[in-house]
C-alpha cells in the first residue's frame, strides 16, 4: 500500500485489479446508452480529465526513484473517474443499458483507489469539472468521451502496476 513514509503498494494486487479495470472499461464502452453516436462533437468537455504525463514519475526510472508521485497521480485519477461514474452523467436519463458493467467499473475504481490509499491518509484529489449536461443526448455523448479517456488512463495505470509487480515487489 502507498502509505505516508513511502512504503510500497501491493503491486500484484494492484496489477490484477488494474487489468480487470481495463477489461471493464472496454466492455462498458458500447453499453452506456441507446443512441447511435456518429457525431462526437469537440473534445472540450473532456479536456479536464486526469492524464498520466511525462513529469508524473510513472516511467521505470521514476518508479524506482520514488513511486509515490506516480501512485498519487493514479490515485487522483481513480477518484476523479469514480466520482464521475456516480454523478448525474451516468445516473441520469437515458438510463444505462441493463447489461452495462458500469456498476462493476465503479466498484473497481474505488477498490483500486483504496488499495493505493489506506484510510486515515489523504492525498489531494482533483476537482471534478462542473459538467451538468441538461439534455439526454449531451449526457450520452459525455459518457462515451469519459469512458474513452478512462480506457486510456487505466491502460497506462495497468502498465505501471505490471512493471511494479515485475520489478519492485519485495
Amino acid at each position: 500500500r502507498a502509505v505516508p513514509g513511502g512504503s510500497s503498494p501491493a503491486w500484484t494486487q494492484c496489477q490484477q485489479l488494474s487489468q480487470k479495470l481495463c477489461t471493464l472499461a472496454w466492455s462498458a464502452h458500447p453499453l452506456v446508452g441507446h443512441m447511435d453516436l456518429r457525431e462526437e462533437g469537440d473534445e472540450e468537455t473532456t479536456n479536464d480529465v486526469p492524464h498520466i504525463q511525462c513529469g508524473d514519475g510513472c516511467d521505470p526510472q521514476g518508479l524506482r526513484d520514488n513511486s509515490q508521485f506516480c501512485l498519487q497521480r493514479i490515485h487522483q485519477g481513480l477518484i476523479f473517474y469514480e466520482k464521475l461514474l456516480g454523478s448525474d452523467i451516468f445516473t441520469g436519463e437515458p438510463s444505462l443499458l441493463p447489461d452495462s458493467p458500469v456498476g462493476q467499473l465503479h466498484a473497481s475504481l474505488l477498490g483500486l483507489s483504496q488499495l493505493l490509499q489506506p484510510e486515515g491518509h489523504h492525498w489531494e484529489t482533483q476537482q471534478i469539472p462542473s459538467l451538468s449536461p441538461s439534455q439526454p443526448w449531451q449526457r450520452l455523448l459525455l459518457r462515451f468521451k469519459i469512458l474513452r479517456s478512462l480506457q486510456a488512463f487505466v491502460a497506462v495505470a495497468a502498465r505501471v502496476f505490471a512493471h511494479g509487480a515485475a520489478t519492485l515487489s519485495p
Partner: antibody
Framework: HVQLQQSGPEVVRPGASVKLSCKAS????????MTWVKQRPGQGLEWIGQ????????DYNEIFEGKATLTVDTSSSTAYIQLSSLTSEDSAVYYC?????????WGQGTLVTVSA | DIQMTQSPASLSASVGETVTITCRAS??????LAWYQEKWGKSPQLLVY???TLAEGVPSRFSGSGSGTQFSLKINSLQSEDFGSYYC?????????FGSGTKLEIK
C-alpha cells in the same frame, strides 16, 4: 432477437465432471459479458461467475473457485461452464445470462443431477 | 461480499391489491440494483434495473425505488400473472449477490 440456447439435462456420477454449453445468437457475442447462475431445487439464485469473450478473462465467485471453469468459443458464439468433482450439492439448474449488470436475457437453464 | 437482505420471505395478496417488497444491501451499492420475477419452471425475468428503470416490456404497474442501501419493488393492482417469486440482485462489483427471494402467493 437475442437468444441463449443451453445444452440438455445431464445425469452424472459423484466425482465426475460435466461441461454445459450456452449458444448465443441475435447479438455481437464478443461485446457482452456472459454470466452463469446456479439454482438448487426450491432455493434461490447464486452468481457463479462471468466471462468477457474478447479477452477470455473470467471472474469467479470465491465459493465456486476450483469448482467451475468458464470458457468461450467466439467462433461459434458459445459459452461453456465446466463443473468438476461433482457432489450432490452441485445438483441444480445452471443458467447462462447475458451481461455484466442486470440480466435481461437468460438461457432456459440446464438441469444437472448428481446421482450414484 | 455484499449481502442482500430481502423481506418478506413470503406474502399472500389478492388480485387488485398493491404489494411492496424490500431489499437491504449490507453496504452502499448506489443505484446498482435489479429485480427479477421467477415462475415455476421458467428462467428469471428482469423487471427493474439501476434501482428504478423498468426493463423492456414490463408493465407499468411495477416500479422500483431506492438508492444506497434501501430499495423496494412495488406492484400496483396485482394481476394473476404476477404471482411467483421475486429476487433482488446488486450489480455493483463482483461477486454479484441475490436476495433470498420473496414468494408472492394468491390469497
Amino acid at each position: 432477437h437475442v437468444q441463449l440456447q443451453q445444452s440438455g439435462p445431464e445425469v452424472v456420477r459423484p466425482g465426475a465432471s460435466v461441461k454445459l454449453s450456452c449458444k448465443a445468437s441475435g447479438y455481437i457475442f464478443s461485446a457482452y459479458w456472459m454470466t452463469w447462475v446456479k439454482q438448487r431445487p426450491g432455493q434461490g439464485l447464486e452468481w457463479i461467475g462471468q466471462i468477457f469473450p474478447v479477452r477470455g478473462s473470467a471472474d469467479y465467485n470465491e465459493i465456486f473457485e476450483g469448482k467451475a471453469t468458464l470458457t468461450v468459443d467466439t467462433s461459434s458464439s458459445t459459452a461453456y461452464i465446466q463443473l468438476s468433482s461433482l457432489t450432490s450439492e452441485d445438483s441444480a439448474v445452471y443458467y447462462c445470462a447475458r451481461g455484466g449488470g442486470g440480466f435481461a436475457y437468460w438461457g432456459q437453464g440446464t438441469l444437472v443431477t448428481v446421482s450414484a | 461480499d455484499i449481502q442482500m437482505t430481502q423481506s418478506p420471505a413470503s406474502l399472500s395478496a389478492s388480485v387488485g391489491e398493491t404489494v411492496t417488497i424490500t431489499c437491504r444491501a449490507s453496504e452502499n451499492i448506489y443505484s446498482y440494483l435489479a429485480w427479477y420475477q421467477e415462475k415455476w419452471g421458467k428462467s428469471p425475468q428482469l423487471l427493474v434495473y439501476n434501482a428504478k428503470t423498468l426493463a423492456e416490456g414490463v408493465p407499468s404497474r411495477f416500479s422500483g425505488s431506492g438508492s444506497g442501501t434501501q430499495f423496494s419493488l412495488k406492484i400496483n393492482s396485482l394481476q394473476s400473472e404476477d404471482f411467483g417469486s421475486y429476487y433482488c440482485q446488486h450489480h455493483y462489483g463482483t461477486p454479484f449477490t441475490f436476495g433470498s427471494g420473496t414468494k408472492l402467493e394468491i390469497k
